[in-house]
């Protein structure tokens, strides 16, 4: 009710002889500040005196008198809130009731606190979770209902008397609600901790033992098993017997079922602690274990690897890689199931035993066509030799070999012939599928690998073929050696270097560009007349009569070829000049007379000069001299001179007679 003082503190405090006690305490007085405080031990109310009797442990009065006991007991409070007390050291006879007598100006109050002091340090208390399972982390708690500032203590964890490695977390509480020291240890128990003793040990600041609490761990775990095998190395031969025994070294709770597994799969009808395998076969090789279950779950033993040894099985050959390209590398692998693994191998190529090849692998760094064929092997171990399997085929692929171009025609080949060539090869893998020819031409391929050249040209010198599968192999070019008549025959003037003048020495050469065969004959002709049979035609002193159209012919065993006609031109000064008169050399006066200066010249006359009988040059310079009308006095002898680039020529005199007309005669 409202007439009560309000106090807060632990109901009971615990300590032991020689330790100390710290009493956390708060209060609220009914009115005003605290004026007087007395700490009683086991106070009793005296009705007669209306006062409390008992041992006074501490007294605080207005006059300030404090008994000697006050050195052990301390009031750490104040006049309005705090009533905390400390007793140091605390003694066994301090056990009982502590009475806090509080007086203010108008009110009084007696507050009671229980103190339990034991003769020796009391043990802490270990708290465990309700169930502990292997490998699951748990927290172990050690609780001691004691804490005092003046008396440091420590709690240590031990497993089977040995300090535990795990770090513990210690906490203390000194509050009006509770006073304790607590240590918490996080711990993952293993099955092997089952039944082990855990201790929480109370020690003083120097590590001196004060007290302890112990518990026995009850760690739930799956069955722990040991497997034993006879023979102990678990290596047997086909037909032998094997016994495996499963022993339970620990189980909590008790086991319920047993089974056996091979390579992780349960063996049917094997539910006892002994597994008997009679007359084992190689298929029974594998990893065996036993499995025993309890309420926690199944436990498995370690695996026993049972090796049933047997001679190698028939071998197979693996080729990396087939088909193989010539020049590449290839590896053969001999595969044979055997136990123990084969120690020796025998290799065969096309059924013949290969020497010096006794490894599991055969490596060929650079494959050649001769490596092709069937490869087989035999494996051998301590128990015997296997059988040779079917083998594997190595296919070596390569370009066509020894390719040749062959001329099918009878020799020699003449220009214009039809030539047939074939492309031959020695071997090829894969097969030849096509052929190529060089140079390219509009030629026929009547069948695969055959080339037909119709009307072969004189200049078809060489032909090469290639036989192709995945690759093309070229043959060396073959010379057709086509024979033909001389070609490009022409006449060439060797001398003189400039134009030919009459009287010059002249040489003509009969040239040709090529001839096969090379042996040739020459023929010169002019106007169908044979002039010579040498390559040159020579004139010591050329005359205008030698001018004309010349041809030369060149002959070989294939045929003859003529040059184009070549015109020989001879340059000479005007010659054979004469004056011709028209209408005649007798003309009647008054008529017209034409004198023409005729000549033979090369080049033609470019300039004419006329002269009279007095060798007087006339003012006329053309080829014709026209007199119109002609007069009697024109009668007389005339001559002309012709000029060209070579020189001059003159005609003999020609006489013109002009007679009188009848009219003139009549007038006379």
């Amino acid at each position: 009710d409202s007439s009560k003082w309000v106090f807060e503190h632990p109901e009971t405090l615990y300590a032991w002889e020689g330790a100390c006690v710290w009493i956390p305490c708060t209060y609220r007085a009914l009115d005003g500040d605290l004026e007087s405080f007395i700490l009683f031990h086991n106070p009793e109310y005296n009705k007669n005196t209306s006062k409390f009797d008992g041992t006074r442990l501490y007294e605080s009065t207005k006059d300030g008198k404090v008994p000697s006991e006050q050195k052990r007991v301390q009031f750490l409070g104040d006049k309005n809130k705090n009533c905390t007390l400390s007793i140091h050291p605390v003694h066994l006879n301090d056990s009982g009731q502590l009475g806090l007598r509080m007086e203010s100006k108008t009110e009084k109050w007696m507050e009671r606190i229980h103190l339990n002091v034991s003769e020796r340090p009391f043990p802490p208390h270990i708290q465990l979770p309700p169930e502990i399972q292997e490998s699951q982390e748990v927290t172990l708690t050690c609780l001691l209902n004691f804490s005092c500032y003046g008396y440091p203590i420590q709690l240590q964890w031990l497993l089977e008397g040995v300090p535990m490695r795990q770090a513990a977390v210690t906490s203390t509480s000194l509050t009006i609600k509770s006073v304790f020291t607590r240590s918490e240890l996080k711990f993952s128990p293993q099955w092997s901790h089952h039944g082990k003793i855990v201790t929480c040990q109370l020690q003083d600041a120097d590590g001196k033992f004060l007290s302890n609490d112990t518990v026995q761990l009850n760690v739930k775990h799956t069955p722990k098993l040991e497997i034993k095998v006879t023979p102990s190395d678990a290596i047997v031969r086909e037909g032998d017997s094997v016994t495996m025994t499963c022993e339970v070294s620990s189980s909590n709770p008790e086991y319920t079922t047993v089974s056996w597994l091979k390579d992780g799969t349960s063996l049917k009808k094997q539910n006892t602690f002994t597994l008997n395998l009679r007359e084992v076969t190689k298929d029974q090789s594998g990893k065996y274990c036993c499995q025993v279950s309890n309420d926690v779950g199944p436990g498995r033993s370690e695996e026993v690897f049972l090796q049933v040894q047997y001679a190698p099985e028939p071998s197979t050959v693996q080729i990396l890689h087939s088909p193989a390209v010539e020049g590449s590398q290839v590896e053969f692998l001999c595969m044979s199931l055997a136990n123990p693994l084969p120690t020796n191998y025998t290799w065969y190529h096309n059924g013949k035993e290969m020497q010096g090849r006794t490894e599991e692998k055969v490596h060929i760094p650079k494959i050649l066509p001769w490596h092709a064929g069937t490869y087989s092997c035999v494996a051998e171990n301590i128990l015997g030799t296997g059988q040779r399997g079917p083998g594997a085929e190595l296919d070596v692929q390569y370009p066509p070999k020894k390719v040749t171009t062959v001329i099918q025609n009878p020799m020699p080949i003449r220009e214009g012939d039809t030539v047939t060539l074939s492309c031959n090869y020695n071997s090829s893998n894969p097969s030849v599928t096509r052929y190529e020819w060089k140079p390219h031409g509009a030629w026929e391929e009547p069948s695969l690998g055959v080339l037909k050249i119709q009307n072969v040209g004189w200049d078809n010198t060489t032909i090469a073929c290639a036989a192709c599968n995945s690759w093309c192999s070229w043959a060396s070019p073959v010379a057709l050696n086509v024979q033909y008549a001389p070609r490009d025959v022409r006449v060439r003037k060797i001398k003189p270097l400039s134009e030919i003048h009459s009287g010059n020495s002249v040489s003509l050469q009969c040239d040709f560009s090529s001839s096969h065969p090379k042996e040739v004959q020459f023929f010169w002709e002019k106007n169908g007349r044979l002039l010579g049979k040498e390559s040159q035609l020579n004139f010591d002193s050329i005359s205008p009569e030698d001018a004309g159209s010349y041809s030369c012919w060149v002959n070989n065993s294939i045929g003859q070829t003529a040059s184009k006609a070549w015109t020989l031109e001879v340059l000479y000064a005007p010659r054979r000049l004469r004056v011709s008169m028209s209408p005649g050399d007798q003309v009647m006066e008054g008529k017209s007379a034409t004198l023409t200066c005729e000549s033979d010249a090369n080049p033609p006359v470019s300039h004419y000069t006329w002269f009279d009988w007095n060798n007087q040059s006339l003012p006329y310079h053309s080829q014709k001299l026209r007199l119109e009308p002609v007069k009697v006095q024109h009668s007389g002898a005339y001559w002309c001179q012709g000029t060209n680039s070579v020189g001059k020529g003159r005609s003999p005199l020609s006489t013109l007679t002009v007679y009188y007309s009848p009219e003139t005669i009549g007038r006379r």
């Epitope: 290969m354 020497q355 050649l368 001769w370």
Partner: nanobody, 122 residues
Framework: QVQLVESGGGLVQAGGSLRLSCAAS????????IGWFRQAPGKEREGVSC????????YYADSVKGRFTISRDNAKNTVYLQMNSLRPEDTAVYHC???????????????WGQGTQVTVSS
């Protein structure tokens, strides 16, 4: 094109020695078998000796072991067969052969030479 040319054959008395040579050309691999086989008139071909070019390992027919030695001169591309303690039964045409492997019956006879006559008189 592989070409093998043998030389060094001849007539020798029993207990004598001969050295056969085989000049090889045209082999495009560094790893091949080369060796000797022999053929006597009316008899089966018999492998005599073989060696691998890659590692120089050598093999001999039981009938010539300890008497014949195969060797090579890489620089000259030549293989030799040194024949000691010759016997009349060694009389045969000796062929040099090259191939992929040494076989128990001799070299893999992919390519072989014309042979050289060895006659051992008693």
């Amino acid at each position: 094109q592989v070409q093998l040319v043998e030389s060094g054959g001849g007539l020798v008395q029993a207990g004598g020695s001969l050295r056969l040579s085989c000049a090889a050309s045209g082999i495009t691999s560094d790893d091949y078998a080369i060796g000797w086989f022999r053929q006597a008139p009316g008899k089966e071909r018999e492998g005599v000796s073989c060696m691998y070019s890659s590692d120089g390992s050598t093999y001999y027919a039981d009938s010539v072991k300890g008497r014949f030695t195969i060797s090579r001169d890489n620089a000259k591309n030549t293989v030799y067969l040194q024949m000691n303690s010759l016997r009349p039964e060694d009389t045969a045409v000796y062929h040099c052969a090259a191939g992929p492997w040494c076989f128990v019956t001799g070299v893999g006879r992919e390519e072989w030479g014309q042979g050289t006559q060895v006659t051992v008189s008693s």
